[in-house]
């Protein structure tokens, strides 16, 4: 007789999940020496234990601690990109400018990246058919707990002036119901952390508009202002070109504004 | 290119002891777990011993456990299997093997050697 399933309203366990986070530790130390000392078995097992046999609506960040600990990594606190909306730029940037860092260079950002993994409660097995939709189901789900998790550790580490990359095309850019808005910006610490800069990137080739006096991004800085940290604005008119410049600072066409 | 070069193997009595060992080359050792696997005559292939990349953790087939003690030093791109109170029925080729990891009873294997033989008789 089947057993009775949950079905929940979001996708399921990426296929290939344990093999897929143990792929990725292993990629990480061989590509960072200094993670060499990280057991990829402690870490898988400690990231499993976080969820499975747990009721998938009920996770809480306690749970993901032994896989905090083990995944303990010092990155450069005053080289910390963050990001809203707008991954594969930040992303390309962090590839370019390589001593900077968004959450998804460090090990434990990297393992789970792109990833979804649930598991039900008192069986030991993953849920490959469906997950919690933090919207529709729950916002306790492994996935929302992980990030939430990790994105408060990584603001807390930050310090001097912390960059955010926000994405100008969207109706709010700044959204306080992100990742960055409701989770990042509340833990940065203000004896640490001297000025938020956000860098608002432009969708569209012809717009000149000034994206740092939008209402969102006012709002950005009032309640950074609140927490004793500066704020400061930038405009990236060309994401193309900003990423080239990156690459190649001595061009010519790089002194313009971008 | 990755090699794994496997030596060690011979013929021993039962109860007696052999120690394998296995030689990496062309990758990262120290990021990836590291197998013993076997295939005695006209059988499939068992898994016997595993141990992570550290060396932290360390797993054994119930039919050697007690018995078999694996090991590796990352200084050296090596992986050993001391193997004692060796049976007939240890009988088999061994293989050195590279992977990821383990979930559960599953070994993500990657690389393996050519292998060596062991023969236990009298």
């Known amino acids: 007789v089947p057993r009775w399933r949950q079905q929940w309203s979001g996708p399921g366990t990426t296929k290939r999940f344990p093999e897929t986070v143990l792929a990725r530790c292993v990629k990480y130390t061989e590509i960072h020496p200094e993670m060499r000392h990280v057991d990829c078995q402690s870490v898988w097992d400690a990231f499993k234990g976080a969820f499975i046999s747990k009721h998938p609506c009920n996770i809480t960040e306690e749970d993901y601690q032994p896989l905090m600990k083990l995944g303990t990594q010092t990155v450069p606190c005053n080289k910390i990109l963050l990001w809203s909306r707008i991954k594969d730029l930040a992303h390309q940037f962090t590839q370019v400018q390589r001593d900077m860092f968004t959450l998804e260079d460090t090990l434990l950002g990297y393992l789970a990246d792109d990833l979804t993994w649930c598991g039900e409660f008192n069986t030991s097995k993953i849920n490959y058919q469906s997950c919690p939709d933090w919207r529709k189901d729950c916002s306790n789900n492994p996935v929302s707990v992980f990030w939430k998790t990790v994105s408060r550790r990584f603001a807390e580490a930050a310090c001097d002036v912390v960059h955010v990359m926000l994405n100008g095309s969207r109706s709010k850019i700044f959204d306080k119901n992100s990742t960055f808005g409701s989770v990042e910006v509340h833990n940065l610490q203000p004896e640490k952390v001297q000025t938020l800069e956000a860098w608002v990137i432009h969708g569209g080739r012809e717009d000149s508009r000034d994206l740092c006096q939008d209402p969102t991004i006012k709002e950005l800085e009032s309640i950074i202002s609140k927490r004793n940290i500066q704020f400061s604005c930038k405009n990236i008119y060309r994401p193309d070109k900003f990423l080239q410049c990156v690459k190649n600072p001595e061009d010519s066409s790089c002194t313009s504004e971008i | 290119e990755v090699q794994l070069l496997e030596s060690g193997g011979g013929l021993v009595q039962p109860g007696g002891s052999l120690r394998l060992s296995c030689a990496a080359s062309?990758?990262?050792?120290?990021?990836?777990?590291m197998s013993w696997v076997r295939q005695a005559p006209g059988k499939g292939l068992e898994w016997v011993s595993g141990i992570s990349n550290t060396g932290i953790n360390t797993y054994y087939a119930d039919s050697v456990k007690g018995r078999f003690i694996i090991s590796r030093d990352n200084s050296k791109n090596t992986l050993d299997l001391q193997m004692n109170s060796l049976r007939a029925d240890d009988t088999a080729v061994y293989y050195c093997?590279?992977?990821?990891?383990?979930?559960?009873?599953?070994?993500?294997?990657?690389?393996r050697g050519q292998g060596t033989l062991v023969t236990v008789s009298s």
């Open positions: 093997a590279s992977g990821k990891g383990w979930d559960g009873n599953t070994w993500y294997e990657d690389y």
């Open positions: 062309g990758f990262t050792f120290s990021s990836y777990a």
